[in-house]
């Protein structure tokens, strides 16, 4: 029940697939990832006007009580509707260890 | 990776389960659904300050990008960790129908 | 307390009939709106049907429509859901369950009791 993908508050202003740069400084991982150094995370960043990619009826009911109780109910919110798996190289007691992670990179997003 | 449940910001201030009365009307179903006249949708509302309710990994990312971008990475959401179904008497063409929605009622919440 | 208690399921053969009975103890049944859910392995709850307290008026969803009936005998404090024509994809857990006082159905689906199999193979 995905709703409209036209954003009409203007080209990339709604929820959309965002990149942003991160240290492992930057993730608080340094004590315990060795690699990648650098992460490309995929988050959901963006606006979720009224059934722009609303993920299910609990979205749209969302929409309409907003619309009618702005300050008791917040608009529906930018959010991944699926992940990429990621592979980190972790520290270990005993050396280092691979470690796939299934709930870490945004693969797309959805307003709910 | 459900975290932390105590809110640092005050008894109900932290994203959790509301329940709000809405209408047919409220809802812009009055023209296809005959019953129930009035909902009590239950729906996730309120903050998600550092690691409460953090959903998985990415909400643990994004808490930490937040804190060092707040002005391009957006703090977690408060949204449905799972749903409760609901019964809808829906007027058809032919006259009316049962219809279960399995993703109209939050259930309970997490942050993501 | 609210207490329901279905019964009335069993192994029938394409094409067959069952009748499922619902019995109230602890509250007297009309004054309540009742409905009959299934539950498939690993699917969700489905409302099959529902006779509502104020009028007694019937609904049924769209997969059973034409096949199902429910009905109410207040004298025994009990509600049936009658099936014809069953198929394979009627095979279920069948379950009742009372709404609110006034209401035309049990619109949340909730708690419930142990329920009763439904098998419809051949």
């Known amino acids: 029940a995905r709703n409209g993908d036209h954003c009409p508050l203007g080209p990339g202003r709604c929820c959309r697939l965002h990149t942003v740069r991160a240290s492992l400084e930057d993730l608080g991982w340094a004590d315990w990832v060795l690699s990648p150094r650098e992460v490309q995370v995929t988050m959901c960043i963006g606006a979720c006007p009224s059934q722009f990619r609303a993920a299910n009826m609990h979205a749209q009911i969302k929409t309409s009580l907003h619309r009618l109780k702005p300050d008791t109910v917040p608009a529906p919110c930018c959010v991944p509707a699926s992940y990429n798996p990621m592979v980190l190289i972790q520290k270990t007691d005993t050396g280092v260890s691979l470690q796939t992670y299934d709930d870490l990179l945004a693969k797309d997003c959805h307003c709910i | 990776a459900r975290n932390g449940d105590h809110c640092p910001l005050g008894p109900g201030r932290c994203c959790r389960l509301h329940t709000v009365r809405a209408s047919l009307e409220d809802l812009g179903w009055a023209d296809w659904v005959l019953s129930p006249r009035e909902v009590q949708v239950t729906m996730c509302i309120g903050a998600c300050p550092s690691q409460f309710r953090a959903a998985n990994m990415h909400a643990q990312i994004k808490t930490s990008l937040h804190r060092l971008k707040p002005d391009t990475v957006p703090a977690p959401c408060c949204v449905p960790a799972s749903y409760n179904p609901m019964v809808l008497i829906q007027k058809t063409d032919t006259g009316v129908s049962l219809q279960t929605y399995d993703d109209l009622l939050a259930k309970d919440c997490h942050c993501i | 307390q609210l207490q329901l208690v279905e019964s009335g399921g069993g192994l029938v053969q394409p094409g067959g009939s069952l009748r499922l009975s619902c019995a109230a103890s602890g509250f007297t049944l009309d004054y309540y709106a009742i409905g009959w859910f299934r539950q498939a392995p690993g699917k969700g709850p489905e409302a099959v049907s529902c006779?509502?307290?104020?009028?007694?008026?019937?609904y049924y969803s769209d997969s059973v429509k034409g096949r199902f009936t429910i009905s109410r005998d207040n004298a025994k404090n009990t509600v049936y859901l009658q099936m014809n024509s069953l198929k394979p994809e009627d095979t279920a857990v069948y379950y009742c369950?009372?709404?609110?006082?006034?209401?035309?159905?049990?619109?949340?689906?909730?708690?419930w009791g142990q329920g009763t199999q439904v098998t419809v193979s051949s």
């Open positions: 369950a009372a709404g609110e006082y006034g209401s035309d159905c049990p619109v949340q689906v909730g708690s």
């Open positions: 006779i509502s307290s104020s009028d007694g008026s019937t």
